[in-house]
């Protein structure tokens, strides 16, 4: 049982990219407000987004404390203007979220090619090491800091005049590939966590091509 004239939240969904994590739910409130609570399996509940009319709550600050923990959230519904009101069981109406383990489930954000440099028939392609909101010792960690060797990048590269995409892979943020002299190449990268079964791959980075500003060419 729950409070009179309130509707329980439903379709509770975690939306998370590079650990920026938001809980979303329905319905849009009519004469009601919501409060969210989050906890680890073994921890205490912590309240967030008090008495909000939003249907989302940013829980990043909580989950980044330990991205390998499994979290559960719940959304409480209260009558607008009467948030102390409870049902006959003495507890407001609420709905539980699915469990969420950030390390295993956060989506990988679209990567960016930071630079590429050609030296003769070799090209060094560097992927930007994106900063996350995960902190250690008061500094924000990069995606590589968090995932280590669990994170790899796949580079797709092709001659501007051709359609076939060659691939290279790295568990750092740099590729060193062989290219044909005098040919212009284009590049795109994808972040991958091979050990996952879901949310394994990011979307592709924007394509960068030689002859554009980002690159540098040196004849050796």
């Amino acid at each position: 049982s729950g409070t009179t004239n309130t509707v329980a939240a439903y379709n509770l969904t975690w939306k998370s990219t590079n650990f920026k994590t938001i809980l979303e739910w329905e319905p849009k409130p009519v004469n009601q407000v919501y409060t969210v609570q989050i906890s680890t399996k073994s921890g205490d509940w912590k309240s967030k987004c008090f008495y909000t009319t939003d249907t989302e709550c940013d829980l990043t600050d909580e989950i980044v404390k330990d991205v390998k923990q499994t979290y559960l959230a719940r959304v409480f519904s209260y009558p607008a203007g009467n948030v102390e009101s409870t049902g006959s069981a003495g507890e407001p109406l609420y709905e539980n979220s699915p469990e969420f383990t950030p390390y295993l489930e956060t989506n990988l954000g679209q990567p960016t090619i930071q630079s590429f440099e050609q030296v003769g028939t070799k090209v060094n392609v560097t992927v930007e090491d994106e900063r996350t909101l995960v902190r250690r010792n008061n500094t924000f960690l990069s995606l590589r800091d968090v995932f280590g060797k669990d994170l790899i990048y796949t580079l797709y590269y092709w001659k501007s005049s051709s359609s076939g995409k060659k691939t290279a892979k790295t568990n750092t943020n740099e590729f060193l590939i062989d290219v044909d002299k005098g040919e212009n190449y284009c590049f795109s990268v994808q972040a991958v966590i091979p050990s996952r079964t879901v949310n394994r791959k990011s979307t592709d980075s924007p394509v960068e091509c030689m002859g554009q500003e980002k690159g540098e060419f040196r004849e050796i």
Epitope: Y156, K165, T167, A168, K169, D178, S188, Q190, D204
Partner: antibody
């Protein structure tokens, strides 16, 4: 359970066409790379080409370039190998295989294979 | 393309023997080498990945190692079910290439 099942093989005349299918179950193909590998009777393994179903990117062995096309239908969780202008030397068992996209790029699951015979 | 030169092309051995198969890459492939086992009429099966890592479910008598561009598959004590053909494969760069295969036969 992860499974790849090839179909569509058979006897075809030189110059003819054939389309092979690779139906995946137990995983989503758009999260992986799918390769085609062939093996002529009594011979070794020869890589044919790959597709990344998440973006449609492909690459082919020189021996099939311009004649073979790999595609994927993510709604059917199936990859395809369209083979045109077939030659006697294309006679082989054709396998599809899953690449988990690790740094070493190993193929962790293979289909059972489908035999393509090109003969007049 | 990177060539993978595998040797020997065939060998005869007895149950309990230690068997070694080698593959030499024509250029640096880092550790991006896998080994597969294939039995007649069957698809290849992954044994070793990243040059030296045993794939899940593969018996511990199989092992892999790397020295520069030379890669070795070792079967420490050959079992009856190990008589098969073995292939190395590099996937350091596209196109991935296979060795010619080594057929392990009963002596």
């Amino acid at each position: 359970e992860v499974q790849l099942v090839e179909s569509g093989g058979g006897l075809v005349q030189p110059g003819g066409s054939l389309r092979l299918s690779c139906a995946a179950s137990g995983f989503t193909i758009s999260h992986y790379i799918i390769h085609w590998v062939r093996q002529a009777p009594g011979k070794g393994l020869e890589w044919v080409g790959y597709i990344d179903p998440s973006n449609g990117y492909t690459y082919y062995a020189d021996s099939v370039k311009g004649r073979f096309t790999i595609s994927a239908d993510t709604s059917k969780n199936t990859a395809y190998l369209q083979m045109n202008s077939l030659r006697a030397e294309d006679t082989a068992v054709y396998y599809c295989a899953r690449d988990i996209q690790s740094v070493s790029g190993e193929f962790d699951y293979w289909g059972q294979g489908t035999l393509v015979t090109v003969s007049s | 393309d990177i060539q993978m030169t595998q040797s020997p092309s065939s060998l005869s051995a007895s149950v309990g023997d230690r068997v070694t198969i080698t593959c030499r890459a024509s250029q640096d492939v880092n550790t991006a080498v896998a080994w597969y086992q294939q039995k007649p009429g069957k698809a290849p099966k992954l044994l070793i990945y990243s040059a030296s890592f045993l794939y899940s479910g593969v018996p511990s008598r199989f092992s892999g190692s790397r020295s520069g561009t030379d890669f070795t598959l070792t079967i420490s004590s050959l079992q009856p079910e190990d008589f098969a053909t073995y292939y190395c494969q590099q996937h350091y760069t596209t196109p991935p290439t296979f060795g010619q295969g080594t057929k392990v036969e009963i002596k």
